[in-house]
């Protein structure tokens, strides 16, 4: 067996010789060198060599602890004549001895750290650390003490856990803000002999708010204009404050004084300054000079420093206000006038008024800016701010008028100032109801007594856009013995209801019904439309056919001659007729015009004029273009002068050539498929200044029935199948 | 259905004042024009005063010009008559009526007497 | 002023009786004429507008007509009830002017 205890070896060995470690040995070993002992493992035959005879081992080199605390090796005894081990291979530890050989090392070599300023003593700081390589199981080779070499009174640090403490009251960061403490770290539990190692702790004390701001002076003093709008920044003060970062922080307010409403104090946040800025418009004239209290404090306050004093300071500020020229001020920032449409000219509607605020009171003028009424539709009195109509007014046209009026110092013009006045114009029954559309209806020639033809609705362009009430009723010229009666429905609509059972359309083909709408405001307003009953012929459903008296539709007997010869002779007679009144210039019939009592009932009037050529009317062309309206006593409800068209078309303008202008109506009446195909007056209130010799017969117009093209017909769906058949095909060039 | 209700007569001084009121009910009274019509007792019917339907335009007859006062609240459905300087021959029922021209609807009529 | 005259003052008539009243006016007012009824300690009622237009409600006895300066109402078959005095009264221009009225009485 083997026979060897654990071996041990001193580190860092310095002496010339090999280091001996220990012998290997076996009981087998005779001592007559048969045996022959082997190393091997860790550092065999390296750093650890064997007499292979005797068993020595020796440490060729000086070992580190620290580096390589134990080594394990193999042994081995080998009968040296056989080669065979006489043991059985064992392993066995080398544990290297720990000298004192390394001194503590801090984890940093500077730590930095902070601490609030007047913080309580034994206030923790910061905590270092030191390590030493050593062994910490074998004596006090790794047993480190921490001591501080530099930063008394202010720090100290406990030995065993390197904590740092405050050790001093009341460290002020105002006086002082940076210390530089160096701490010691010794082994051999801090005895004689120990290594050590240092390291510095850079600390800093943070700001706490123990300082209150405070004014560098009691008084301040600035001037500023009155002209000064709200917002405007007259001066700056500043507190100053020895913390630091929020801890100097400032709010500014105005706690008191004669203008504290007048004025506003901000902070401007990047210098920590009080800006004074105006709040309320000033006026050099009530007041020149504000005195103010303007406070300064911290907004972030420690309770546990309260006991140092009120941490705000205050000062006084004297504002004084520089007089301006001023312009004059009305006495509102807007007017609002009403007016009735009726107003006649130069009616005064209200007044404004401004005067100059300063102190000299210059004398005021008023005048409408021109922009805001370019139709001069308004004055004013320069002198007393009257404002008057001159022109007429229609609501119904522009309900508001946004005027403007400038006020302007007479002694010095350049100060002026401007307001807004709008002006409403009040309603005033001046419109009368009307038809809502055009009427033009039908009567079957079978129709029975008190058949409903058409419902009339009316509109009326004055107020109440709530509604209206509307009456109606036939003309009273047309009431008697008329072939239809109006029925009022009481809901602003009536309904044209038949009056007897049966009309001829060969007796009459077209009625004109002349209905009088009425409201029932004030002063009452009204007018009279008229609606074109046409008799037809229908089918049994009441469904129209024929509107049109056969006998006059098919002009069968007649050639494109006759039909000439017709309208030549009549041309000349027309001709005759128009240059006989034109020098006549005076009729001895009923005059045109009706009397002023009955224009109120704007009757729009139609001459009968139906039958043929003895009884045409010669027209004075001055009457013709009298704009006044007319009516003929005569019966209302017959054949019209001119059978009306679906929609009214614009009159020609005054520079447009009358011959242009009528040869349009001749195209129109041309391809109207309602013109009627006996000779009837169109009449026009525009005749230009020439001649008005030209006929404008409704035979002369189509000079024979294939000018007309009725393919329309048949694009009127099934009502007009009959008429579409009895004109498709017919063809004119056969007509001979 | 319609109804007119007028309230505030009475007996007054000559000079003196008064305000009659018609409550209107049963029809859209902002689109109406209204009517105040009188009939002194055992007289005939005089037309007094009207206002449109926005308030916006008022008449009178002669011989109240000046010193009748017509308003209308809409908002209420109320007409008003204001009577300043009244004399003895004010004295009528005093009705007030529907419409601007022709009157559809009358109140039953409230009576000022005007005596000293 | 347009003065509105009526005729009769008043007249008797009995039950079935047809009855006329007219009005003139003092110039023309086209058809702008109402006629009204109004029985004692009542106020009156519109029975036509517009010179022949019946007001909705009224009986078909009552018609009216004219034109201009005269107009006419008529009763075509009088009735217990119709006994009343009657107005007319034009809206043709301001003032507006009633006439002094016709009062129907049993005969």
């Known amino acids: 067996s083997w026979m060897w205890n654990q071996f041990f070896l001193l580190e860092e060995y310095t002496g010339s010789d090999y280091q001996y470690v220990g012998k290997l040995h076996s009981d087998q070993d005779r001592g007559d060198g048969s045996l022959k002992y082997i190393l091997s493992g860790d550092g065999a035959g390296d750093l650890f060599i064997i007499n292979e005879n005797t068993g020595d081992i020796q440490a060729t080199k000086r070992l580190d602890r620290e580096e390589k605390p134990v080594y394990i090796l193999r042994a081995q005894a080998i009968n040296r004549r056989t080669g065979r081990p006489v043991e059985p291979e064992s392993e066995f530890i080398i544990k290297i001895h720990d000298i004192n050989d390394n001194e503590p090392i801090f984890t940093k070599d500077v730590y930095t750290a902070t601490v609030p300023e007047m913080a309580d003593v034994g206030t923790f700081v910061v905590q270092v650390t030191a390590t030493d390589a050593d062994d910490p199981t074998y004596g006090n080779s790794a047993k480190v003490v921490y001591s501080i070499l530099q930063g008394q009174p202010y720090f100290s640090v406990e030995s065993e856990t390197g904590i740092i403490k405050t050790a001093l009251l009341n460290m002020d960061r105002e006086n002082r803000e940076q210390y530089q403490v160096v701490i010691q770290a010794k082994d051999m539990g801090g005895q004689m002999g120990g290594l050590s190692g240092t390291t510095t702790v850079n600390i800093t004390l943070t700001d706490v708010n123990d300082n209150p701001p405070r004014f560098p002076q009691s008084t301040y003093q600035f001037k500023t204009p009155e002209s000064s709008p709200p917002g405007t920044p007259i001066g700056r003060i500043k507190a100053s404050d020895a913390d630091v970062g929020e801890n100097a922080e400032i709010e500014y307010s105005i706690t008191d004084g004669e203008g504290h409403d007048m004025f506003d104090v901000i902070t401007d946040q990047e210098t920590q300054e009080g800006i004074i800025t105006v709040k309320k418009l000033l006026d050099f004239e009530k007041k020149r000079v504000y005195t103010l209290k303007v406070e300064a404090s911290n907004p972030h306050i420690e309770p546990r420093f309260l006991y140092l004093g009120p941490f705000k300071d205050s000062a006084t500020v004297r504002i004084v206000v520089d007089d301006v020229d001023e312009p004059p001020v009305f006495s509102k920032p807007a007017y609002i006038l009403q007016i009735r449409e009726d107003a006649q000219i130069n009616t005064t509607i209200g007044s404004v008024a401004a005067q100059d605020p300063d102190a000299a009171r210059n004398p005021v003028k008023y005048s409408v800016d021109r922009h805001t009424d370019m139709d001069r539709i308004f004055n004013i009195d320069s002198g007393n701010g009257s404002i008057f109509t001159s022109k007429l007014l229609d609501r119904e046209t522009l309900l508001w008028h946004n005027i403007t009026v400038i006020a302007t110092e007479i002694n010095n013009p350049k100060q002026s100032s401007r307001v807004p006045l709008y002006i409403k114009v009040l309603d005033v029954n001046d419109n009368a109801p009307e038809f809502a559309e055009f009427y033009e209806t039908f009567v079957c020639e079978k129709a029975k007594a008190d058949q409903l033809i058409q419902t009339l609705h009316a509109v009326d362009k004055d107020d109440p856009y709530s509604g209206h009430q509307f009456s109606f009723s036939l003309a009273p010229e047309a009431a008697s013995g008329s072939n239809f009666t109006i029925q009022d429905n009481k809901d602003n609509t009536a309904g044209i209801l038949t009056r007897k059972n049966g009309y001829n359309r060969h007796e009459m083909s077209t009625y004109l019904l002349p209905v009088v709408i009425s409201d029932n405001d004030y002063p009452v307003q009204s007018s009279t439309g008229t609606v074109t009953v046409r008799v037809c012929a229908c089918d049994h459903h009441g469904n129209m056919q024929s509107c049109h008296a056969e006998a006059l539709i098919h002009p069968t007997g007649l050639s494109t001659g006759a039909l000439v010869a017709i309208l030549l002779c009549i041309v000349i007679l027309l001709v005759t007729v128009v240059l006989f009144a034109a020098l006549r210039r005076q009729r001895k019939k009923e005059p045109l015009i009706i009397s002023k009592e009955d224009i109120r009932d704007n009757i729009v009037s139609y001459n009968d004029e139906g039958g043929g050529e003895e009884d045409t009317q010669a027209f004075d062309i001055g009457t013709l273009r009298n704009p006044k309206p007319w009516r003929q006593q005569s019966r209302r409800d017959m054949v019209p002068e001119a059978l009306f068209l679906p929609r009214r078309t614009p009159t020609a303008r005054d520079n447009t050539d009358v011959r242009d202008f009528i040869s349009q109506r001749l195209r129109k009446m041309n391809t109207d498929p309602t013109a009627p195909p006996y000779d009837s007056l169109a009449t026009y209130a525009y005749e230009g200044t020439g001649s008005v010799a030209d006929s404008l017969s409704s035979l002369e117009s189509v000079t024979t029935d294939g000018d007309q093209d009725y393919g329309y017909l048949s694009d009127w769906g099934p009502r007009f199948k009959k008429l579409a058949d009895m004109y498709g095909g017919m063809d004119s060039d056969k007509d001979s | 259905q319609v109804q007119l209700l007028e309230s505030g007569g009475g007996l007054v001084q000559p000079g003196g004042s008064l305000r009659l009121s018609c409550a209107a009910s049963?029809?859209?009274?902002?689109?109406?024009?209204m009517s105040w019509v009188r009939q002194a007792p055992g007289k005939g019917l005089e037309w007094v005063s009207v206002i449109r339907s926005s308030g916006s335009s008022t008449y009178y007859a002669d011989s109240v010009k000046g010193r009748f006062t017509i308003s209308r609240d809409n908002s209420k459905n109320t007409l008003y008559l204001q009577m300043n300087s009244l004399r003895a021959e004010d004295t009528a029922v005093y009705y007030c009526?529907?419409?601007?021209?022709?009157?559809?609807?009358w109140g039953q009529g409230t009576l000022v007497t005007v005596s000293s | 002023d347009i003065q509105m005259t009526q005729s009769p003052s008043s007249l008797s008539a009995s039950v079935g009786d047809r009855v006329t009243i007219t009005c003139r006016a003092s110039q023309s007012i086209s058809l702008w004429l109402n006629w009204y009824q109004q029985k004692p300690g009542k106020a009156p009622k519109l029975l036509i507008y517009a010179a022949s237009t019946l007001q909705s409600g009224v009986p078909s006895r009552f018609s009216g007509s004219g034109s201009g300066t005269d107009f006419t109402l008529t009763i075509s078959s009088l009735q217990p009830e119709d006994f009343a005095t009657y107005y007319c009264q034009q809206y043709y221009t301001s003032p507006y002017t009633f006439g002094q009225g016709t009062k129907v009485e049993i005969k």
């Open positions: 009526a529907r419409g601007g021209g022709y009157f559809d609807y």
């Open positions: 049963g029809f859209t009274f902002s689109s109406y024009a």
